[in-house]
């Protein structure tokens, strides 16, 4: 297993609709053809694999399971979007990148993006 640098923004504010997007960039030391990206949430004394995707370079990301994430890739960048977030989902979201093929296997883990989610205020009652 070889180490690899992964960069991601320090802070992101989710939209009022509970959507947060950020870029995860990795310094690929070679020509990887198969890449796995996992988003981890570290908060509340827990570590959770929020979503994971495997993709072949140049193709769309295919997310596993009941994913609340979507994303696209461009070169060594992955554009990740997490949907359906609420204030309680605020936390540190860490990007983990694995170069699966061809060998050797590389692993990189970012420092995390602190995603802040603010629940929208309910609209006041209207007389109209």
């Amino acid at each position: 297993c070889k180490a690899m640098h992964v960069a991601q923004p320090a802070v992101v504010l989710a939209s009022s609709r509970g959507i947060a997007s950020f870029v995860c960039e990795y310094a690929s030391p070679g020509k990887a053809t198969e890449v796995r990206v996992t988003v981890l949430r570290q908060a509340d004394s827990q570590v959770t694999e929020v979503c994971a995707a495997t993709y072949m370079m140049g193709n769309e990301l295919t997310f596993l399971d009941d994913s609340i994430c979507t994303g696209t890739s461009s070169g060594n960048q992955v554009n990740l979007t997490i949907q359906g977030l609420r204030a309680m989902d605020t936390g540190l979201y860490i990007c983990k990148v694995e170069l699966m093929y061809p060998p050797p296997y590389y692993l990189g883990i970012g420092n995390g993006t602190q995603i802040y989610v603010i629940d929208p205020e309910p609209c006041p009652d209207s007389d109209f």
């Epitope: 979503c51 994971a52 596993l64 399971d65 997490i82």
Partner: nanobody
Framework: EVQLVESGGGLVQTGGSLRLSCAAS????????MGWFRQAPGKDREFVAA????????SYADSVKGRFTISRDNAKKMAYLQMLFLKLEDSAVYYC??????????????????WGQGTQVTVSS
């Protein structure tokens, strides 16, 4: 709801290992996110680990990360908790639980509506 029965608990020395099993019956097992919780005497029930419906995504409490591994076999309607390097503070009754919801960011708070009867894990020095 599904019916859940845990097994595999017991007495083990510090540093030892156990594998807990959770057998499900009833509704379609693969529709449920599965979780493990534990409760020590005089303490609140706490989240240990959870696994998504297909088994591809997992969540762990910091206190067990790297020592415990959650897994599932949908064909056999089973969930498992492999526990290594057990510590005195791991002693508790361990419960298997099922939540009929998809995965998300905070599986510890999912609406687990099915619970097993629990299995006792005792770690001694």
């Amino acid at each position: 709801e599904v019916q859940l029965v845990e097994s595999g608990g017991g007495l083990v020395q510090t540093g030892g290992s156990l594998r807990l099993s959770c057998a499900a019956s009833g509704r379609t097992f693969s529709n449920y996110t599965m979780g493990w919780f534990r409760q020590a005497p005089g303490k609140d029930r706490e989240f240990v680990a959870a696994i998504s419906r297909s088994g591809s995504l997992k969540s762990y409490a910091d206190s067990v990360k790297g020592r415990f591994t959650i897994s599932r076999d949908n064909a056999k309607k089973m969930a498992y908790l492999q526990m290594l390097f057990l510590k005195l503070e791991d002693s508790a009754v361990y419960y298997c639980a099922a939540a009929p919801v998809p995965w998300g960011t905070r599986p510890s708070t999912f609406p687990y509506d099915s619970w097993g009867q629990g299995t006792q894990v005792t770690v001694s020095s």
